[in-house]
Interface confidence: low
């Protein structure tokens, strides 16, 4: 009886999600039955969150908006291990946008969802950021330094990273 | 569909104010990212402020930090551009824009979804 209700409201917790996203990957949690992890297919997970790669190349608001109608944001970088797992899943020779901005141009980078920036975890490339009008912060790849981050324009298209908290049911 | 009205323009002297109104007709008005713009006869459009969502940050063009003052009023879903300390090369048509994401005001009118018509505004001695 126990088991019944558990999975009604697991049906309808599944039906919910399913006018954005028809298929959910699973994944048990631990060793609990009850506990089951999902993120949309074909999103990729590390910890408690879900990342999507969009290959389409849009400007920063129209990423950010292409997250959000998923009910996820540009993506926010918070360690250094979360951004060594995205960068497997990028390629090399493109750019793309992170949920990290500087809308009023005078160095005051905040993440698309409150997280406060803390200058200590980021990842920058070496002499960046550099442009007061470049106000929008991308994730590439440099042969020198590997992958970091640099400010662009905000309106030139580029591909981007969607980040969302995993699904519980 | 979400329509906007731009008011409140005129011609005013140098130095003095101007207070430009904006009306907003959705129900989604608290959610959407508010923007002003101006076109100047023969030049491009300008960025000249954009307010979030819940008004709590607003970001001016360089040409009218200090004199223009942008807010929002939820509850009569309008938007207002006080306009002080006014100088010819404001002379332009106003433009009031709305972004359907509110959580972004980036100064770039290719992000705007929604646009008004516009209200002459002329500063001359």
């Known amino acids: 009886n126990f088991m019944y209700s558990k999975t009604v409201k697991r049906l309808s917790k599944l039906r919910e999600y399913q006018q954005y996203h028809p298929s959910l990957t699973c994944v048990m949690e631990g060793k609990d039955i009850e506990d089951w992890s999902c993120c949309p297919t074909p999103w990729t997970s590390f910890q408690s969150s879900c990342y999507f790669i969009s290959t389409g190349m849009q400007s920063w608001t129209k990423s950010q908006k292409n997250c959000s109608v998923m009910g996820a944001d540009l993506v926010v970088i918070n360690t250094r291990e979360e951004q060594d797992f995205i960068i497997q899943n990028l390629k090399r020779n493109s750019s793309y946008f992170l949920g990290l901005s500087d809308p009023g141009g005078r160095r005051h980078w905040q993440w698309v969802d409150q997280t406060p920036y803390n200058e200590n975890v980021t990842f920058w490339h070496s002499g960046e950021p550099n442009n007061l009008d470049e106000r929008c912060a991308i994730i590439n790849f440099r042969s020198s330094e590997e992958w970091g981050w640099n400010d662009i324009h905000c309106h030139v298209p580029q591909k981007s990273i969607c980040k969302m908290k995993k699904i519980y049911i | 569909q979400v329509q906007l009205q731009e008011s409140g323009g005129g011609t005013v002297q140098p130095g003095e104010s101007l207070r430009l109104s904006c009306e907003v007709s959705?129900?989604?008005?608290?959610?959407?990212?508010m923007a002003w713009f101006r076109q100047a006869t023969g030049k491009d459009r300008e960025f000249v402020a954009a307010?979030?969502?819940?008004?709590?940050?607003?970001v001016y063009g360089d040409s009218v930090k200090g004199r223009f003052t942008m807010t929002r009023d939820h509850p009569k879903k309008m938007v207002y551009l006080q306009m002080d300390n006014l100088k010819p090369e404001d002379t332009a048509v106003y433009y009031c824009?709305?972004?359907?994401?509110?959580?972004?005001?980036?100064?770039?009118?290719?992000?705007?979804?929604?646009w008004g018509q516009g209200t002459q505004v002329t500063v001359s001695s």
């Open positions: 824009a709305g972004d359907l994401d509110g959580r972004t005001w980036h100064g770039d009118d290719l992000e705007y979804d929604y």
């Open positions: 959705t129900d989604t008005f608290s959610s959407l990212a």
């Open positions: 307010i979030s969502w819940s008004g709590a940050s607003t």
